[in-house]
């Protein structure tokens, strides 16, 4: 798909920036822009990403207890948080026609959840209730996307600050299930 | 030292038109791409055009598109704003402005000069 | 009228937070990056931060931005007298033809 990804103490996902998204076509002009096409441009160029950790979007690991009510879940879970800046703030020489670059603004990217899992986990309980079973559905990896009015809003959890911060609120897409397995799914214990 | 001069503002009648430069200086030139930026006695911040390194990269306010043109000259670090057809509500200070950070906003600003339409 | 809605006004007293917000719609703000400025009396303006929450070097890490939605805002921590300014979030706007838009402005009052 045109995404690097290495490790560190986190995932560091990298866009290819030459295969962001392009506005919808009736938002762009008919021009034709890519100077990789025609030639590229000269060879210094200002928006060459020098420092790439700048903007990346960061899959950190964290591991979790799931709870449901006074249970607990015997192993702890692991899953992601997206955190991290999408930019891009510099360009690939190579992007040059894929994006407005010279615009003081352009599309937000945000990183945030790209796929989930689905993992079984066994709560126990305590005064000697039967232990219960509960799929919980996790974040499996993240990726930077273009904002647009229908992301939901727990996704695009505010990245004013650069602390990654662990995601709370409804999950995208829930399935049909009791109020006591979301909060079996969501209640956070980082 | 990073540096955005512009000249050729003055009082004009409207209908007619007016030619501004903006020189630069302290910067690889073209490494930038340069916007016009106006602001009306006592009012706030108006964006009237941009362009990146060549006539193909060009964007303008709804509000000046038709009469107003950009352009920018790498060899002589330049940058212009024709301005055709002159209105009274044209009448501002007009800053030249650059980014070398694609969306990073207009970084460099110069001190801007005003251009009064009047009869 | 302004594309970008600013309060006209806000102030504090040196030391304090003030907060400045910027609304707007997708076209703009819900989709794009927004970028604030810091116009002092009489001065040019001067780009304080930039694709939301990232400051040019040299800004004081007491400005933050911050975006939610179709809404943005500047904080300005441990206020003080010489940030008495205008401030104006500005951001690009992908209807019609598209342009870049400004708010109104906030004028900032250090008490």
């Known amino acids: 798909q045109g995404w690097q990804a290495f490790k560190n103490d986190a995932t560091e996902i990298i866009p290819e920036l030459g295969e962001y998204p392009e506005p919808p076509p009736e938002l762009e002009n008919n021009k034709t822009m890519n100077r990789a096409e025609n030639g590229g441009r000269p060879p210094h160029h200002p928006f060459e990403t020098k420092d790439v950790s700048e903007y990346s979007c960061r899959e950190l690991h964290f591991t979790r207890y799931v709870t449901d009510g006074p249970c607990r879940s015997a192993k702890p879970v692991t899953e992601l948080v997206c955190s991290g800046q999408c930019g891009p703030a510099r360009l690939l020489p190579n992007a040059i026609g894929r994006g407005k670059w010279w615009r003081p603004s352009g599309p937000d990217f945000r990183c945030i959840p790209d796929r989930y899992r689905a993992q079984r986990v066994q709560l126990l309980c305590p005064g000697g209730e039967a232990p219960r079973a509960r799929k919980v559905r996790l974040v499996a990896s993240c990726k930077c996307k273009r904002l647009t009015r229908f992301h939901n809003q727990s996704e695009l959890k505010d990245f004013g600050t650069e602390a990654a911060r662990p995601q709370k609120g409804r999950k995208p897409r829930p399935r049909a299930r009791s109020a006591k397995a979301n909060q079996a799914e969501l209640e956070n214990a980082y | 030292e990073v540096q955005l001069v512009e000249s050729g503002g003055g009082l004009v009648q409207p209908g007619r038109s007016l030619r501004l430069s903006c020189a630069a200086s302290g910067f690889t030139f073209d490494d930038y791409a340069l916007h016009w930026v106006r602001q009306a006695p006592g009012k706030g911040l108006e964006w009237v055009s941009g362009i990146g390194w060549d006539e193909d990269m060009i964007d303008y306010a709804d509000s000046v598109k038709g009469r107003f043109t950009i352009s920018r000259d790498n060899a002589k670090n330049s940058l212009y704003l024709q301005m055709n057809s002159l209105r009274v509500e044209d009448t501002a200070l007009y800053y030249c402005a650059g980014n070398n950070r694609g969306y990073g906003g207009l970084d460099v600003w110069g001190q801007g000069t005003t251009v009064t339409v009047s009869s | 009228q302004s594309v970008l809605t600013q309060p006209p006004s806000a102030s504090g007293t040196p030391g304090q937070r003030v907060t400045i917000s910027c609304s707007g719609s997708?076209?703009?703000?819900?989709?794009?990056?927004v970028n604030w400025y810091q116009q002092l009396p009489g001065t040019a303006p001067k780009l304080l931060i930039y694709?939301?929450?990232q400051r040019p070097s040299g800004v004081p890490d007491r400005f933050s931005g911050s975006k939610s939605g179709t809404s943005a805002s500047l904080a300005i921590s441990g206020l003080q007298s010489e940030d008495e300014a205008d401030y104006y979030c500005a951001a690009w706007d992908d209807s019609l033809s598209g342009e870049y838009v400004f708010g109104g402005g906030t004028k900032l009052t250090v008490l």
């Open positions: 997708w076209s703009n703000i819900g989709s794009n990056t």
């Open positions: 694709n939301n929450n």
